[in-house]
């Protein structure tokens, strides 16, 4: 048998905020006319299911968000590459669980400058996961221990910190007409998750009094 890595490499899920994309690379002997077909299944199931819309494709990604939408389930996906010359190779992912493996994007935050304070309002983060009644769940719905960590860089040596589960925060006692750098992260201790930071550079308003 030939080495499957000649045609196909690095088959893996890339998951952000529960959007689960299967990606892969062609091997050294892959060509632009190599076609890829994708299948998926859940833990312990015998049969692989062909993913509609991802059969004999030439791109190197396939969106499996809907098919892998149960965040308590374990999933696998596999890719079969077929070259123009008729050679084929199949590779599968490791077990994938979105709750465990999804990475968190930076939160969506509005930073509002005031004269002696900066207010930060964190907006709920929607996910593609739907509740029983059809509405989309937010990260906050899914991770019950989710909290926000906020930091305000006052100068090179001094930072102010706030944190909690609420959505509205305010840093008080600031100097008017001064620029501050705010960073806001989502933290989920149970799953040891931290989002990339949202950053806002904000100048407090001048004191007109």
């Amino acid at each position: 048998p030939e080495d499957p890595s000649d045609l196909l490499q690095h088959v893996k899920f890339q998951s952000n905020n529960f959007e689960n994309i299967l990606t892969w690379d062609s091997g050294p002997e892959g060509t632009p006319d190599t076609v890829y077909s994708i299948e998926y299944k859940t833990y312990g199931e015998r049969d692989w299911v062909a993913k509609k819309g991802c059969q004999r494709i030439t791109r190197k990604s396939c969106n499996l968000t809907v098919e892998t939408g149960n965040h308590t389930e374990l999933y696998y996906a596999r890719v079969t590459a077929v070259s123009a010359g008729g050679r084929s190779a199949t590779k599968m992912t490791d077990r994938f669980n979105s709750l465990q493996h999804t990475a968190l994007k930076p939160p969506d935050v509005t930073c509002i400058p005031k004269v002696r304070s900066i207010q930060m309002i964190v907006h709920p983060t929607p996910t593609p996961i739907r509740a029983g009644d059809g509405h989309r769940l937010t990260l906050e719905d899914i991770f019950h221990d989710l909290f926000y960590h906020l930091e305000l860089q006052v100068n090179r040596t001094y930072q102010m910190h706030l944190g909690g589960e609420q959505r509205e925060y305010e840093f008080f006692g600031l100097t008017p007409d001064t620029e501050f750098l705010g960073t806001i992260m989502i933290c989920v201790p149970t799953w040891s998750k931290k989002s990339a930071p949202y950053m806002c550079r904000v100048r407090t308003l001048p004191d007109r009094t």
Partner: antibody, heavy 116, light 113 residues
């Protein structure tokens, strides 16, 4: 037709090492998980560990971690079980078995005897 | 580790009669994602590797005669051979795949009375 054929068993002295092979045919080894299971003479079945042949990711029964190593050569469509520091109680028939939860195809097994 | 305990250790049944093997797990095998039980049954004849009979506690493997059936949920499971045939003489094992390490029962030997 899916077939698994083990080889590499035999007599080995206590403290010695042995590498077992499991040649897969009838399918690409990278398309399903592969496991090793052993059975001591007249005894029950004991799961050693598994490998995802596509990624090389392994999970072991803690009892065997450190002494036994599972690997794959994709180009040969073959899985391996490297066994080190062997003791008399490792005497058993060693099977490779396919799938990720339960085991749908098994090899015929290869006998490993650890004795001085 | 999940401990799997089979009973009886051996069983002698007349040809054409029903054989019942029990398997008890030390914790529930109910998999919350699909509400199925992560239990498999195997048959092993002398000098041969085990053969998969049943998975998900009650799903019969392709090609397995319908006299073999699996039932049970949670921690208590049963393999039933509805009408024992001569070729069913073997050792039968249950196996859990709920969590690592996967573990087997000690086996039940089925003989003809």
């Amino acid at each position: 037709e899916v077939q698994l054929v083990e080889s590499g068993g035999g007599l080995v002295q206590p403290g010695g090492s042995l590498r077992l092979s499991c040649a897969a045919s009838g399918y690409s080894i990278t398309a399903e998980y592969m496991n090793w299971v052993r059975q001591a003479p007249g005894k029950g079945l004991e799961w050693i560990g598994e490998i995802n042949p596509s990624t090389g990711t392994t999970t072991y029964n803690q009892k065997f971690k450190g002494r036994f190593t599972i690997s794959v050569d994709q180009s040969k469509n073959t899985a391996y079980l490297q066994m080190n520091s062997l003791r008399a109680e490792d005497t058993a028939v060693y099977y490779c078995a396919r799938f990720d939860a339960y085991f749908d195809y098994w090899g015929q097994g290869t006998l490993v005897t650890v004795s001085s | 580790d999940i401990v799997m305990t089979q009973s009886p250790d051996s069983l002698a049944v007349s040809l054409g009669e029903r054989a019942t093997i029990n398997c008890k797990s030390s914790q529930s095998l109910l998999y919350s994602s699909n509400q199925k039980n992560t239990l498999a049954w195997y048959q092993q004849k002398p000098g041969q590797p085990p053969k998969l009979l049943i998975y998900w506690a009650s799903s019969r493997e392709s090609g397995v005669p319908d006299r073999f059936s699996g039932s049970g949920s949670g921690t208590d499971f049963t393999l039933t051979i509805s009408s024992l045939q001569a070729e069913d003489v073997a050792v039968y094992y249950c196996q859990q795949y709920y969590s690592y390490p996967f573990t087997f029962g000690q086996g039940t030997k089925v003989e003809i009375k």
